[in-house]
């Protein structure tokens, strides 16, 4: 990492695929070396609760429930190592949810994919790329959030009731944009401001629902760093 450069933060949604980007600059002249390149990804998990054993999130077995700022700092471990011939190694058994895209690797993209990402995957990741006589590196911090949509009041509604839907993702900064939509047979239909739909940031207010409003409602939260999350809620309106 360059002196003074901050470790970039990558956000992901628990239960969804997460990409940990790693595309170091490699001159065109040396792209042929990528066929013989190897990469090793290491993970330094976030600290767990004090009573818990460190554990390795990407290894099988029980894991601490939530990352926290206190407790012992778990040891760094190798998530995955891919040699020049594509031979994979790491903590056994190697999990199928930890993946490198082989075609991407030949283009110089050594991104690690977690399919899906779990809460215990949070922490700092480092990749070391070995390219003949050069060692390149990537470093980033993975933060995981939970997405939810809540209805107030909750539960089934009757015709003419009001409801507020709140779309949220557990991330400290506010989303740059929020888009609401309905899932219809023909696909997504955007929800626009109208007497029936009032939009305010991550809230959608329906002053008078009808049975026609039953079904899936969704929102897309997009953040300034490009991260976006789609959340669905099934509304039930009784006739």
């Amino acid at each position: 990492l360059q002196p003074g450069a901050e470790v970039p933060v990558v956000w992901a949604q628990e239960g969804a695929p997460a990409q940990l980007p790693c595309s170091p600059t490699i001159p065109l002249q040396d792209l042929s070396l990528l066929r013989r390149a190897g990469v090793t990804w290491q993970h330094q998990p976030d600290s767990g609760p004090p009573a818990a054993a460190p554990g390795h999130p990407l290894a099988p077995g029980p894991h601490p429930a939530a990352p926290s700022s206190w407790g012992p700092r778990p040891r760094r471990y190798t998530v995955l190592s891919v040699g020049p011939g594509g031979l994979r190694s790491g903590r056994l058994p190697l999990q199928p949810r930890v993946q490198l895209d082989e075609r991407g690797r030949q283009r110089g993209d050594f991104s690690l994919w977690l399919r899906p990402a779990r809460r215990a995957d949070a922490g700092e990741y480092r990749a070391a790329v070995h390219l003949r006589d050069r060692a390149l590196s990537c470093r980033l911090r993975l933060r995981l959030g939970q997405a939810s949509m809540t209805a107030s009041p909750p539960g089934s509604l009757r015709a003419s009731d009001w409801v507020i839907l709140n779309c949220s993702f557990s991330r400290p900064d506010r989303p740059a944009s929020v888009h609401w939509f309905r899932n219809r047979g023909q696909g997504r239909v955007p929800v626009r401001e109208s007497p029936h739909h009032h939009l305010a940031e991550s809230f959608l207010f329906l002053p008078q629902v009808s049975p026609m409003d039953s079904g899936p409602w969704g929102c897309i939260l997009t953040y300034r760093d490009g991260f976006n999350v789609s959340i669905m809620y099934n509304l039930t309106v009784l006739g």
């Epitope: 980007p21 790693c22 170091p24 600059t25 065109l28 002249q29 390149l136």
Partner: antibody, heavy 129, light 112 residues
Framework: EVKILQSGGGLVQPGGSLKLSCAAS????????MSWVRRTPGKGLEWIGE????????NYAPSLKDKFIISRDNAKNTLYLQMSKVRSEDTALYYC??????????????????????WGQGTSVTVSS | DVLMTQTPLSLPVSLGDRASISCRSS???????????LEWYLQKPGQSPQLLIY???NRFSGVPDRFSASGSGTDFTLTISRVEAEDLGVYYC?????????FGGGTKLEIK
């Protein structure tokens, strides 16, 4: 201090041959890719080609591949351009340049980049009968 | 081959002016690994070319911060915020994403 000294230019007849030299000092010559570029009166700068440190890869501009040969002698810290079958349009000022290794950093990823950071003073080639 | 087209051909300026040079490529110069290899060189009268900018927007060491560059895909720009006498010469863009590498035709920065 990095110094790149060129020699071998001069007057040559159409269809003739000429060998340009480029001697480097103050650098670990055997670590670097090297390039040849020329400046023609009508066309501005034109990339001729490049050679990697151990001479196993040489890239050429396709239009010049059959008449120019790039080579190097790491023991002598010298780069060469062998010109043959020259024509009047090869009249130009010829430059050799080192491809410097520039460390890069982008969104957590460290890498490197090659660019022509040190150039020779240029040597003039005139093709005329 | 990738054709690099620079505009204008000649750029008359007064000292202290802002100057912008445009460079357009005939095809995208992003290569497979997602990076764009575009450089800018300056050839001052009677001198060899010198590297100003590499990888689209990165100033080479020792290049004054009045030089900046930007762009993506096929459109690139070099800007000098306040032209000084030592900036006069011919500016070339240069793509290193596809072999053969190609220079733009050059833009001559001269005093009005």
């Amino acid at each position: 201090e990095v110094k790149i000294l060129q020699s071998g230019g001069g007057l040559v007849q159409p269809g003739g041959s000429l060998k340009l030299s480029c001697a480097a000092s103050g650098i670990d010559f055997s670590r670097y890719w090297m390039s040849w570029v020329r400046r023609t009166p009508g066309k501005g700068l034109e990339w001729i080609g490049e050679i990697n440190p151990d001479s196993s890869t040489i890239n050429y501009a396709p239009s010049l591949k059959d008449k120019f040969i790039i080579s190097r002698d790491n023991a002598k810290n010298t780069l060469y351009l062998q010109m043959s079958k020259v024509r009047s349009e090869d009249t130009a000022l010829y430059y050799c340049a080192r491809l410097g290794i520039i460390p890069t950093y982008h969104y957590g990823s460290s890498g490197y980049y090659y660019a022509m950071d040190y150039w020779g003073q240029g040597t003039s080639v005139t093709v005329s009968s | 081959d990738v054709l690099m087209t620079q505009t204008p051909l000649s750029l008359p300026v007064s000292l202290g002016d802002r100057a912008s040079i445009s460079c357009r490529s005939s095809q995208t110069i992003v290569h497979g690994n997602g990076h764009t290899s575009l450089e800018w060189y300056l050839q001052k009268p009677g001198q060899s070319p010198q590297l100003l900018i590499y990888k689209v927007s990165n100033r080479f060491s020792g290049v004054p911060d009045r030089f900046s560059a930007s762009g993506s895909g096929t459109d690139f720009t070099l800007t000098i915020s306040r032209v000084e006498a030592e900036d006069l010469g011919v500016y070339y863009c240069f793509q290193v994403s596809h072999v053969p590498y190609t220079f733009g035709g050059g833009t001559k920065l001269e005093i009005k």
